[in-house]
């Protein structure tokens, strides 16, 4: 999906308003400086990408993040403010559904919320450019 | 261990700039943030901004939006807080702290007094 | 920005005592407070992190609760090197704020 026509102000006051707190709620007890910041993005479209792609796409040791309340939100903004997103997601949500497992909140998947922050807090940069 | 070592105290006279400076060293340089904090005599601490040191990005507090200034020095992982305009509620001790994505502090340099009287 | 108050702000006490300290934000802040020990002429330590988590090398006697708008630090047995100054923070939301600190003296 190209998310270079999202409503990015949107998106961005979704996060602020309650994105942000799900996923400090998520890492809750972690500390500050557990993990090494190593995923970044350059612009709103290529960080979009990336919170996409680590929100929903299972990883090695990390399963089960698209059912946490910080990527239902997530997938609610990108299906609202980016047109056409909800039409490439069916597809993939009928696969993860298919695959759907108990939810265990491993290291792996802290330190994959961890590098979501990061990205997110790109993305609400001020000056970072559309494209 | 991580360490964060500070610049010594200055005393500026008003209306001047002071540029403080944080070595930081025991940790890879661009995995974290580095905020400053003040804390004037006998007060609390105020959160001046931070900046990430992989590509130096600032986000500052409004309070000291125009006035404050943090830059980077790769090559001797460095960050510096420039004050300028400075004036006498600006005497306070200056502090750099190191945080991951969640913004509480456990590494805290020495602090730098900073001096403003005429 | 949220405004974090502490409570009290002096606190006369005694070896051995209990002593509890307040932090109330003017909004939700889950658990995302940090509590700091702060003496003269050094930098703030590090206690405790999203509102009861133990620091490193924090003695037990050291507990923090709370969740929301309401927080607290308790010290169960008052020891002679911990007199000294409290500041809670959020790290809930940008700008990140600090109470205005609670020094704790010896009476």
């Known amino acids: 999906y190209d998310f270079t026509n999202c409503d990015f102000e949107k998106i961005k006051a979704a996060y602020l308003s309650t994105i942000s707190k799900d996923l400090i709620t998520y890492m809750s007890g972690t500390k500050s400086t557990e993990f090494n910041n190593t995923v970044s993005c350059s612009n709103r479209p290529h960080c979009l990408t990336e919170i996409q792609s680590l929100t929903f796409n299972p990883t090695a040791g990390c399963a089960s993040l698209a059912k946490e309340m910080f990527a239902m939100k997530t997938k609610a903004a990108l299906a609202i403010w980016c047109p056409g997103y909800s039409e490439t997601q069916i597809n993939a949500t009928q696969a993860m559904k298919k695959r759907r497992k108990r939810k265990v909140t491993t290291n792996k998947c802290l330190e994959q919320v961890s590098q979501l922050q990061g990205l997110w807090r790109r993305f609400n940069r001020p000056l970072l450019k559309q494209q | 261990q991580v360490q964060l070592v500070q610049s010594g105290a200055e005393v500026k006279k008003p209306g001047a700039s002071v540029k403080v400076s944080c070595k930081a060293s025991g940790y890879t340089f661009t995995s974290y943030l580095m905020h400053w904090v003040r804390q004037a005599p006998g007060q609390g601490l105020e959160w001046m901004g931070e900046i990430d040191p992989s590509d130096s990005y600032t986000d500052y507090n409004q309070n000291f939006r125009g006035r404050a200034t943090m830059t980077v020095d790769m090559s001797t992982s460095t960050v510096y807080m420039e004050l300028s305009s400075l004036r006498s509620e600006d005497t306070a001790v200056y502090y750099c702290?190191?945080?991951?994505?969640?913004?509480?502090?456990?590494?805290w340099g020495q602090g730098t007094l900073v001096t403003v009287s005429s | 920005d949220i405004q974090l108050t502490q409570s009290p702000s002096f606190l006369s006490a005694s070896v051995g005592d209990r002593v509890t300290i307040t932090c109330k934000a003017s909004q939700d802040v889950v658990t995302a407070v940090a509590w700091y020990q702060q003496k003269p002429g050094k930098a703030p330590k590090l206690l405790i992190y999203?509102?009861?988590m133990r620091h490193t090398g924090v003695p037990s006697r050291f507990s923090g609760s709370g969740s929301g708008t309401e927080f607290t630090l308790t010290i169960s047995s008052l020891q002679p090197e911990d007199f000294a100054t409290y500041f809670c923070q959020q790290y809930s939301s940008f700008t990140f704020t600090f109470g205005q600190g609670t020094k704790l003296e010896i009476k």
């Open positions: 702290a190191l945080t991951g994505t969640i913004n509480y502090f456990d590494y």
């Open positions: 999203w509102a009861s």
